[in-house]
């Protein structure tokens, strides 16, 4: 066997994208590698070129169609192969039977906006992007708020165990700058994981009225 360790991990965004990461200890950075996707019940097949993302890690996106098109279903199986060029031939490095709806990672939520802000609370809404209609309401969210003097890692996680695309943050400090992020996860899928965090939304609470208790 090839020396060292390797890992091949892919996720489906529930619509028309399979994102893959392949890593192998000791592989050369300029190695030319691809991911090939062969569905068991579709007429198409797809290839993407793995591009380096770190010292021994490569990534690529299999674009299956228009961003909001439903290209795969719960019954689909896609055989994914990593192939790397060795001289004049391609060598198979890894193969995975991929069940798209068992390996979900949605796109980060988008369109975060402040609906209403007061001295001690703020109502924020967002939208999910490129999420399959198959989920109906079977989604959950995690949110976090960055307070002054803290890091994102220190921020407590707020869990929304239902498809609720808004949150009312309470017990905030008046006239204070905050940032807010949210991520989403379908309830379906053995290997399903959280989406990336959304772009942070910056907001500021209103100052306390002069001469009043705060």
């Amino acid at each position: 066997a090839v020396n060292g360790t390797s890992q091949f991990t892919c996720f489906y965004n529930s619509r028309a994208n399979i994102s893959c990461v392949w890593s192998q200890d000791g592989a050369l950075q300029d190695t030319s590698c691809q991911v090939h996707a062969w569905p068991d019940r579709r007429r198409w097949n797809q290839t993407c070129e793995l591009l380096p993302v770190s010292q021994a890690s490569w990534a690529c996106n299999l674009i299956l169609g228009a961003p909001d098109s439903q290209k795969l279903t719960t019954v689909d199986i896609v055989t994914l192969r990593v192939l790397c060029r060795e001289g004049v031939r391609w060598r198979v490095m890894a193969i995975q039977d991929f069940k798209p709806f068992e390996n979900l990672r949605l796109m980060a939520p988008i369109s975060l906006q402040v609906v209403h802000v007061e001295t001690h609370r703020c109502n924020i809404s967002w939208e999910i992007s490129q999420a399959s209609h198959y989920f109906e309401r079977h989604l959950e969210f995690e949110a976090r708020t960055l307070s002054p003097g803290h890091t994102w890692e220190e921020a407590p996680l707020l869990t929304l165990k239902q498809k609720q695309e808004w949150i009312c943050l309470e017990t905030l400090t008046p006239d204070t700058q905050y940032e807010f992020q949210v991520r989403v996860k379908p309830l379906q899928g053995e290997f399903t994981t959280w989406s990336p965090w959304s772009q942070p939304l910056a907001f500021r609470t209103k100052p306390a009225a002069l001469g009043k208790d705060t």
Partner: nanobody, 121 residues
Framework: EVQLVESGGGLVQAGDSLRISCAAS????????MGWFRQAPGKETEFVAG????????HYADSVKGRFTISRDNAKNTMHLQMNNLKPEDTALYYC??????????????WGQGTQVTVAS
């Protein structure tokens, strides 16, 4: 508990055939690719063959292609390696392994204890 148990190894003559098997616990067998590796004395562990769990897609090392056939019996949670036209250089301890992927690196998640195959010239 995850268990992979190999069987069927033995001593054969060059040119003979042998079938080795691997029995796996049900959860592993139905959710993981299965494969065979081998290690000859003083040599590194070498990928031999692998088979995926849903489509039974197979992959072979160049050294055994056309001579060895990997298969799986889903009803019995068992994988087989049919080895034909055996050569002395096939002599090794053969290990059964399971992982989410077929990988040519020897870092699969689960391993058996091995079964010895010896090919005499």
């Amino acid at each position: 508990e995850v268990q992979l148990v190999e069987s069927g190894g033995g001593l054969v003559q060059a040119g003979d055939s042998l079938r080795i098997s691997c029995a796996a616990s049900g959860r592993i067998f139905s959710n993981y690719a299965m494969g065979w590796f081998r290690q000859a004395p003083g040599k590194e562990t070498e990928f031999v063959a692998g088979i995926t769990h849903l489509t039974s897609t197979t992959h072979y090392a160049d050294s055994v292609k056309g001579r060895f056939t990997i298969s799986r019996d889903n009803a019995k949670n068992t994988m087989h390696l049919q080895m034909n036209n055996l050569k002395p250089e096939d002599t090794a301890l053969y290990y059964c392994a399971a992982d989410r992927n077929i990988k040519i690196t020897a870092d699969w998640s689960y391993w058996g204890q091995g079964t010895q195959v010896t090919v005499a010239s």
